[in-house]
Amino acid sequence: TKTESSSRGPYHPSECCFTYTTYKIPRQRIMDYYETNSQCSKPGIVFITKRGHSVCTNPSDKWVQDYIKDMKEN
């Protein structure tokens, strides 16, 4: 069975998100994103910043979905 390893808040998620960032990340700082594994206890969108940080976000936040759409289009 898959083990969810711990992460420091919403940053540096190993595989799953346990908490979400409470801040809206400026769009220009984001380079890429990925969706966490569906086996995780809660869903998450991980944004990767230009500085290489991985930030867990809540997929239900409008700004998160807006960023995903923007990145898909571009």
């Epitope: 409470t22 969706e35 979905q65 807006d66």
Partner: antibody, heavy 121, light 106 residues
């Protein structure tokens, strides 16, 4: 006028599979998310899952293993499928829509009247 | 997971009176809280979002307040039409609803 309406529920047996359809009118699924929420008799509201305006489905942890939410943008419908029903799934099932106006797609201002699903042998 | 505890479960108020409903979260939810009104046999109706912002068309006698883990819905000048069950919803973490508070208007 924007509205959503759930298909008829009814009586199901334990281990049955539930399929409910939410039909939306007055807005497009390409700009709205649809949530499924249920309410057992005399109990509070319980989130099941949602499908985003780009068609990605997400689920509550308890529902993930036996729920599937899909949509048909041509027919303006969203479908909830829930397998392995038990008596604990007896509830009124609501679909609810939101366009993110309230900063989050879980916050819904368009609700259907709900449909009663009873699971009993 | 966040647990939302609503108190009281039942409250009675005279017409024109004031009703206060509390919602406590087991962890901070950063004002990501909504309030819904639900009348018997009807779906929920959104009243308040982001803890204190009134949804479209909601009368100003409804007021939301709070931050961190403690949130309050206040109804001033209660009317007969306000008889309903009121539920809080956190949308910071897992989309959890409170157990509901039934408001009876005398």
């Amino acid at each position: 006028c924007q509205s959503v309406k759930e298909s008829e529920g009814g009586l199901f047996k334990p281990a049955d599979t539930l399929t409910l359809t939410c039909t939306v009118s007055g807005f497009s699924l390409s700009s709205y998310a649809i949530n499924w929420v249920r309410q057992a008799p005399g109990e509070g509201l319980e989130y099941i899952g949602w499908i985003s305006d780009v068609g990605t489905a997400y689920y509550a942890s308890w529902a993930k293993s036996r729920s599937t939410i899909t949509r048909n943008t041509d027919e303006n419908t969203v479908t909830l499928k829930m397998t392995s029903l038990t008596a604990a799934d007896t509830a009124t099932y609501f679909c609810a829509g939101g366009d993110g106006s309230y900063s989050n797609y879980w916050v819904s201002d368009i609700w259907g009247q709900g449909t009663l699903v009873t699971v009993s042998s | 997971a966040v647990v939302l505890t609503q108190t009281p479960s039942l409250v009675s108020a005279p017409v024109g009176g004031t009703v206060t409903v509390k919602c406590r979260a087991s962890q901070t939810i950063n004002s990501r809280l909504a309030w819904y009104q639900q009348k018997q046999g009807q779906p929920p109706k959104l009243l308040i979002y982001e803890a204190s912002k009134l949804a479209s068309g909601v009368p100003s006698r409804f007021k939301g307040s709070g931050s961190g883990t403690e949130y309050t819905l206040t109804i001033r000048g209660v009317e007969c039409a306000d008889a309903a069950t009121y539920s809080c919803q956190e949308y910071a973490d897992e989309n959890i609803f409170g157990g509901g508070t039934e408001v009876v208007v005398k």
